[in-house]
Amino acid sequence: PSGLVTANITDSEALARWQPAIATVDSYVISYTGEKVPEITRTVSGNTVEYALTDLEPATEYTLRIFAEKGPQKSSTITAKFTTDLDSPRDLTATEVQSETALLTWRPPRASVTGYLLVYESVDGTVKEVIVGPDTTSYSLADLSPSTHYTAKIQALNGPLRSNMIQTIFTTIGLLYPFPKDCSQAMLNGDTTSGLYTIYLNGDKAEALEVFCDMTSDGGGWIVFLRRKNGRENFYQNWKAYAAGFGDRREEFWLGLDNLNKITAQGQYELRVDLRDHGETAFAVYDKFSVGDAKTRYKLKVEGYSGTAGDSMAYHNGRSFSTFDKDTDSAITNCALSYKGAFWYRNCHRVNLMGRYGDNNHSQGVNWFHWKGHEHSIQFAEMKLRPSNFRNLEGRRKRA
């Protein structure tokens, strides 16, 4: 015979074809072998011109031989070489599917590989590719979009060889809160890292507000609305500034009375105050906290103390906010002017967290009376709020 070729090569099959001998022959003897593969020999009819090779090993170079027989006579042998395809990984599955994450797992191919190419694509056409190592059989997908259909494909690699792709389809779950109205809802969406987040007042996407979320203190889910830490920001500001807010949310800042009013109008909120000074820490929690609107001059409601700092906010309960240019306190003198800050002053303060940073003069500094008195300016202070029923919401999410 002549013209021996292979066609339709896969990872486990190939088709051998040849030109028949000119003379009539009784049969053809076909043999094929590969590295670490025992030789297989088959005899076929003399009028056959092709033979299906099966049960081949993947990614293996085979040597194929064929000769003709007529009675006791044998023709010369012709030879061809071919390499089977790399077989595909198997059983690609998406598990642990969340709103923004999923875990892909697969079984490796029979052939040795040098890696895998993973491709995942959303219905909007966003495609991402990643190459992972040869010993990997799972991969965590992150930064996915909620409520989105994805097609994930995987292909084995071995040098220049590439297997066929296999695929799986999955859909990420929807966010519990597509437009979180506070940091607790952001946390219940699965965001557990403290930092900047966008919240939506009353869940309205038109009312976006960038806030700093504390996701670690006492279970997390806190909107930080005041931070003092280094004295770089000027807190001796006017009414307009305190209404709107000022500063860098990552550093020292005040979120704004208008924002506090809108946030606390969304439901029942609790207040947490964290204080730190020369390695000492203290905290105060109030289970009822709200700030009125501009008509009430942002009247404070704060009740239900627990903690280690001492109940210094009770003195300010029911008071309107005061700044040097809008004196609403009950003192004859202007408390904000006297103490170079702003607060829900009475006459004047037990708490002066917006006082002069580092000023240890009586009542002038960052004070929390029942912790460090009025003659010590506290180094670090944060005020933050979250829904009073956060513990219940958190438990419900865990059960879900």
């Epitope: 006459n347 004047c348 009025h374």
Partner: antibody
């Protein structure tokens, strides 16, 4: 309207004990801190002790610290002052007073007082 | 403890007079200062809290001022029912302390 009625006063020998009570009505008792203030015959006012609305924080004048204990039973709308190791100088009219808030702030409304006489 | 010193200890005045009583704290107390009136055989009555805030129901002839360490109670026009003993009290820190009292009697 707010009413505070003290009881439990009387004549007692030095070194003995006495327990004063104050029955409160006309307001949500556990929303307010309470005080004991005394006045020796012909003398001025002396703050003795105070307790927060929850009962979680208590405060004392140095002259009674370690001898007197303030407590409250919010379920019974009652304030108490347990006075041990009584001395002659503890002789006074003892007033209970309601604060304006839940923490130590301003004694606002006062009862009519109960007389304690320490004498042998 | 914070000492509270009132002056004068006593004063005689006539109906219609303007009367001023002062109170000095031994240390800075912001505006944590209250004034009480006590009549013989009666319990003290809160007149002014937070140095200058008139308690509900107290006549407007009573007024308070001051902050820090020096405070004043003023009765703008003394009435017959105002003859009594007046006490200042600091609520800045515990133990709370009272002044020794100022007795206002009829001249």
């Amino acid at each position: 309207q707010v009413q505070l009625v003290e009881s439990g006063g009387g004549l007692v020998q030095p070194g003995r004990s006495l327990r004063l009570s104050c029955a409160a009505s006309g307001f949500t008792f556990d929303d307010y801190a309470m005080h004991w203030v005394r006045q020796a015959p012909g003398k001025g006012l002396e703050w003795v002790s105070g307790i927060s609305g929850s009962g979680g924080s208590t405060y004392y004048a140095d002259s009674v610290k370690g001898r007197f204990t303030i407590s409250r039973d919010n379920a019974k709308n009652s304030l108490y002052l347990q006075m041990n190791s009584l001395r002659a100088e503890d002789t006074a009219l003892y007033y209970c007073a309601k604060d304006i808030s839940a923490v130590m702030d301003v004694p606002q409304t006062w009862g009519q007082g109960t007389m304690v006489t320490v004498s042998s | 403890d914070i000492q509270m010193t009132q002056s004068p200890s006593s004063l005689s005045a006539s109906v219609g007079d303007r009367v001023t009583i002062t109170c000095r704290a031994s240390q800075y107390i912001q505006g944590f200062l209250n004034w009480y009136q006590q009549k013989p055989g009666k319990a003290p009555k809160l007149l002014i809290y937070d140095a200058s805030n008139l308690e509900t129901g107290v006549p407007s002839r009573f007024s308070g001022s001051g902050s820090g360490t020096d405070f004043t109670l003023t009765i703008s026009s003394l009435q017959p029912e105002d003859f009594a003993t007046y006490y200042c009290q600091q609520s800045y820190s515990t133990p709370q302390t009272f002044g020794q009292g100022t007795k206002v009697d009829i001249k």
